[in-house]
Interface confidence: low
Amino acid sequence: CRTSECCFQDPPYSDADSGSASGPRDLSCYRISSAGYECSWQYEGPTAGVSHFLRCCLSSGRCCYFATGSATRLQFSDQAGVSVLHTVTLWVESWARNRTEKSPEVTLQLYKSVKYKPPLGDIKVSKLAGQLRMEWETPDNQVGAEVQFRHRTPSSSWKLGDCGPQDDDTESCLCPLEMNVAQEFQLRRRRLGSQGSSWSKWSSPVCVPPENPPQPQVRFSVEQLGRDGRRRLTLKEQPTQLELPEGCQGPAPGVEVTYQLQLHMLSCPCKAKATRTLPLEKMPYLSGAAYNVAVISSNRFGPGPNQTWHIPADTHTEPVALNISVGTNGTTMYWPARAQSTTYCIEWQPVGQEGSLATCNLTAPQDPDPAGMATYSWSRESGAMGQEKCYHITIFASAHPKKLTLWSTVLSTYHFGGNASAAGTPHHVSVKNHSLDSVSVDWAPSLLSTCPGVLKEYVVRCRDEDSNQVSEHPVQPTETQVTLSDLRAGVAYTVQVRADTAWLRGAWSQPQRFSIKVQVSD
């Protein structure tokens, strides 16, 4: 037999064992020119001393072989004795170590068996009714194909699937979508209607994330508020990376899970923008306001479940003086200003009503006044902080008020609203004999004492009604009792108590008359 021809004799070996795990496989035969044909195959196992024979059976029942030696590719012409216009069955028998191994056969019409290309270029992936839809441009001059896919997960081997016949300029495939694991897909094509024709090579991997991106398992920590009124949010634990199939490890596009940080500033609701989304790698600085922070995981199919953390307000600011002056026209607040053209957000809320919405006012961008102060004023009619109760006031500042992460805390303090002078007056003042020349004066705590830092001191005044002499005794804001000494028996005294703030002198309580009885000796 000539080497260029298919030899119609018995091959020079005994038999073939098709039950072996090793041996020839993936035989593929197709036309490569008007009269030229090629068959190629893979050989699994040690290749030393292996001889390959391409076997061919014609529709007449006659069979022949090509001896290819150690080569796993053979080219032959339409003059080699193999019918190219009629159906033939081809397979490979590989002889080694006194045994013969056989490939699965292919049955085809060689002339019609054109080498089809796999899907090339961009394979678009989308979700359709809980399934995966892949779509791609049909390779040039190859309309009319049968398409298969294979897919695997990180823990499974390849599984084969069918996309069905395709007959258009674009081809598509519906594939299974896994809920919780990433998948690698590959596609291959062959000519439509030629059952035995060769499949194309497999396409490049298409990496597909799970339908549900993984729940982000992260942990945060937040630093204390610095002198600049800002604190840093830091990530203590990175989200775990998704396990990927073999062909999707490395820079495989399409399977990535991106994590984003969604920041929602709960304080100061009147500002322009309350929410900001930023990449998880870019951890922001925050003001001392209260925030909700969500970590959102998303993949090519959209966002997945998120986890939300609450970051409480940090009220431990540097001691900054807030002056509040109440005049006939209204009330004005003064505080040390920040830079030129700063917008301030003034927020207040009655103490004990933290669950309710705070009142909030945004100033126009303002420059410091000549004394270096910033101001905010409101009229009496507005009713702002008009009730006689304790308010928590926080002032935030930003040169870029629309940028959520550029706000800082200027101060956080308490203020007693309404007519604090009258409302703060101590009640239930009582006098008890203490000794022959002293008394104990007690009173109920001022309403101002419910407001942290507002009550500066109590002042107790004692007047000798005989001589009109007056003495005043300062008392710590935490005390509600004082002892008055060096009093004279039989003299009438009046005692009053007032509660002072840093900026306001309180109103005296109702005068309380008392005297120490003269002791009569026997």
């Epitope: 018995d10 091959p11 070996y13 005994s14 038999d15 073939a16 064992d17 098709s18 039950g19 076997r55 059976c57 529709s59 007449s60 029942g61 069979c63 159906t87 033939v88 069955t89 397979w91 028998e93 013969t100 056989k102 699965p104 056969e105 049955t107 059952q195």
Partner: nanobody, 127 residues
Framework: QVQLVESGGGLMQAGGSLRLSCALS????????MGWFRQVQGKEREFVSG????????DYVDTAKGRFTISRDNARDTVYLQMNSLKPEDTAVYYC????????????????????WGQGTQVTVSS
């Protein structure tokens, strides 16, 4: 995809005869060596008989020699198993199988060697 369809099974008295047929479609029949196997529930499939592509060489399991005959008709794409002198121990599901390769060999007694299988036909022999 090659398809194999068996027929001819049934209920038969001991000593009787049956002829099983197996037709191949969607493939070139003459490219295949053909085999018959049988399986009793709960047991492995066992080789019964085989025939080469040309039909010139045949092979049988010892218990079938002299009683069973395998033949093929390449024009009709069909292989046959003529079973005479049936015994109750011949009761089983009979399967037809096809494989490309050089035949015969003890290799082909191994069910794993075969690529294509029919769905099976029941043969019951009563005493």
């Amino acid at each position: 995809q090659v398809q194999l369809v068996e027929s001819g099974g049934g209920l038969m008295q001991a000593g009787g005869s049956l002829r099983l047929s197996c037709a191949l479609s969607r493939g070139i029949f003459s490219a295949y060596a053909m085999g018959w196997f049988r399986q009793v529930q709960g047991k492995e499939r066992e080789f019964v008989s085989g025939i080469s592509r040309s039909g010139s060489t045949t092979d049988y399991v010892d218990t079938a020699k002299g009683r069973f005959t395998i033949s093929r008709d390449n024009a009709r794409d069909t292989v046959y198993l003529q079973m005479n002198s049936l015994k109750p121990e011949d009761t089983a599901v009979y399967y037809c199988a096809a494989v490309t390769g050089t035949f015969p060999s003890s290799t082909y007694h191994n069910a794993n060697a075969y690529h294509h299988w029919g769905q099976g036909t029941q043969v019951t022999v009563s005493s």
